[in-house]
Amino acid sequence: PCKILKCNSEFWSATSGSHAPASDDTPEFCAALRSYALCTRRTARTCRGDLAYHSAVHGIEDLMSQHNCSKDGPTSQPRLRTLPPAGDSQERSDSPEICHYEKSFHKHSATPNYTHCGLFGDPHLRTFTDRFQTCKVQGAWPLIDNNYLNVQVTNTPVLPGSAATATSKLTIIFKNFQECVDQKVYQAEMDELPAAFVDGSKNGGDKHGANSLKITEKVSGQHVEIQAKYIGTTIVVRQVGRYLTFAVRMPEEVVNAVEDWDSQGLYLCLRGCPLNQQIDFQAFHTNAEGTGARRLAAASPAPTAPETFPYETAVAKCKEKLPVEDLYYQACVFDLLTTGDVNFTLAAYYALEDVKMLHSNKDKLHLYERTRDLPGRA
């Protein structure tokens, strides 16, 4: 089997550890990239025919070029990061409380502050800081990377030649943590939404607190929930139509459990999408509304879908499911106009439902234009 994910996670480790290169430390970042390239070359024999391999190779080429890295030069050694304790450092590691975030948190604070990140549709990203972006991010991208877990998504074009992409694969790595959980990997793909980790298990393994990590199938093949109580985290993965959606509720303390903030620029839930990967879908929305369906193709970041909706039909479809004209509604209209796939209405609807369930601040369920990301903000 292809082990390209191992290369990906080694690269994440090398670029987000305590001794990781800062964003301006190009020689060290280039060394990490060369290591990543070497790792992918080693896996070529068993991965060369797979999309994940080619996505990694192209991603490396892009990053090498962006950072002006030479192909020859030193490489970095993969580092294993040590995980900080999830609670009071005096606590015995075999205590069941260490595997229950809220119980251990309450020992030294009031109530944890929870944050939310979601990815759905074309894809639209809601960051931990409630910024809302529409992104291209084709290929494999890290959504979350902290001391406790990694989440990587792979996005593929919705239509041939389109800048609009949607999530076709999701990999979540829950890192080995004290007496609570063994390392567990969850992987979902289009038409493959398992209710188990890749090793077939449904909890955190054989450790004392293994049940602090659990997978529950809510709707077979369509909706899975993963509870990671040891880090106070809930993840919802759905398949809506052909594509996947992701939503997470995570304590701020866990979100911020990164060892070098300067090296976290690549992680979408934290920093959002890079500026060159963002689509100004609201300008598109205004353009489509103002000029009507006939001029739509000119405004579209993608080739017009084979059976695209007239603007009025898209609006009507989205209003059925999303009565409040917020950014989720606008995302819905955008997705229908760019793809012609009515399932994107449901993707926006379920994304909003997941926000209702996972977001701790009920005043922030709906986002409106004034809170959108302005050009120039990273």
Epitope: P1, T46, R48, G49, D50, L51, E189, D191, E192
Partner: antibody
Framework: EVQLVESGGGLVQPGGSLRLSCAAS????????MNWIRQAPGKGLEWIGM????????HYADSVKGRFTISRDNSKNTLYLQMNSLRAEDTAVYYC????????WGQGTMVTVSS | DVVLTQSPLSLPVTLGQPASISCRSS???????????LEWFQQRPGQSPRLLIY???NRFSGVPDRFSGSGSGTDFTLKISRVEAEDVGVYYC?????????FGQGTKLEIK
């Protein structure tokens, strides 16, 4: 659950042609390289060839090069093996398998080349 | 082409006893810095082959821990710590380091 179902096998005369299909489900077919492997009656396994996820490259065993062609239709989640100029020694069960190197296999389809 | 030679070709084993199958390659299967693409497959009677071990020693998903693989370079071994009735079948080694990919000729495991 990964499922691969081969079809199209049967009896064919030497020099004849046959096209095998492999219908894939339970995984994202368009993300993976795919292989064809065969097994002559009572014999061992022989790798025939593989195709990249996007059909950009194909690799074949010398024994079938120039006679067999592997193709795929990602929109139909289907892998194909076009076999021309068939010989008696091509008689075998033909398996399709997922991955650049095979991990999950289909149940196989029997091809008999005989006059 | 890389030739993989398995021994023994037939292996009668008593239930509960260990079993060992050797696979020798005509050239080194090390691809790069210790990456060696040698796999083991099991084919039960009337069934399709099933992947047991990849990259010499890694058990594939769902494979019992009584199966283990070892070796390097040109010499490889598949071990079954305690043979069970369901282990009956033919075992093949397979290399993916060099094109064309090749299989060993198979070892038939049967119960004494």
């Amino acid at each position: 659950e990964v499922q691969l179902v081969e079809s199209g096998g049967g009896l064919v005369q030497p020099g004849g042609s046959l096209r095998l299909s492999c219908a894939a489900s339970g995984f994202t077919f368009s993300n993976y390289g795919m292989n064809w492997i065969r097994q002559a009656p009572g014999k061992g396994l022989e790798w025939i060839g593989m195709i990249y996820y996007d059909s950009s490259e194909k690799h074949y065993a010398d024994s079938v090069k120039g006679r067999f062609t592997i193709s795929r239709d990602n929109s139909k989640n289907t892998l194909y093996l076009q076999m021309n100029s068939l010989r008696a020694e091509d008689t075998a069960v033909y398996y399709c398998a997922k991955g650049t190197t095979p991990d999950y296999w289909g149940q196989g389809t029997m091809v008999t080349v005989s006059s | 082409d890389v030739v993989l030679t398995q021994s023994p070709l037939s292996l009668p084993v008593t239930l509960g006893q260990p079993a060992s199958i050797s696979c020798r390659s005509s050239q080194s299967l090390e691809y790069s810095d210790g990456y060696t693409f040698l796999e083991w497959f099991q084919q039960r009677p009337g069934q399709s082959p099933r992947l047991l071990i990849y990259e010499v020693s890694n058990r594939f998903s769902g494979v019992p821990d009584r199966f283990s693989g070892s070796g390097s370079g040109t010499d490889f071994t598949l071990k079954i710590s305690r043979v069970e009735a369901e282990d009956v079948g033919v075992y093949y080694c397979f290399q993916a380091t060099h094109d064309p990919l090749t299989f060993g000729q198979g070892t038939k495991l049967e119960i004494k």
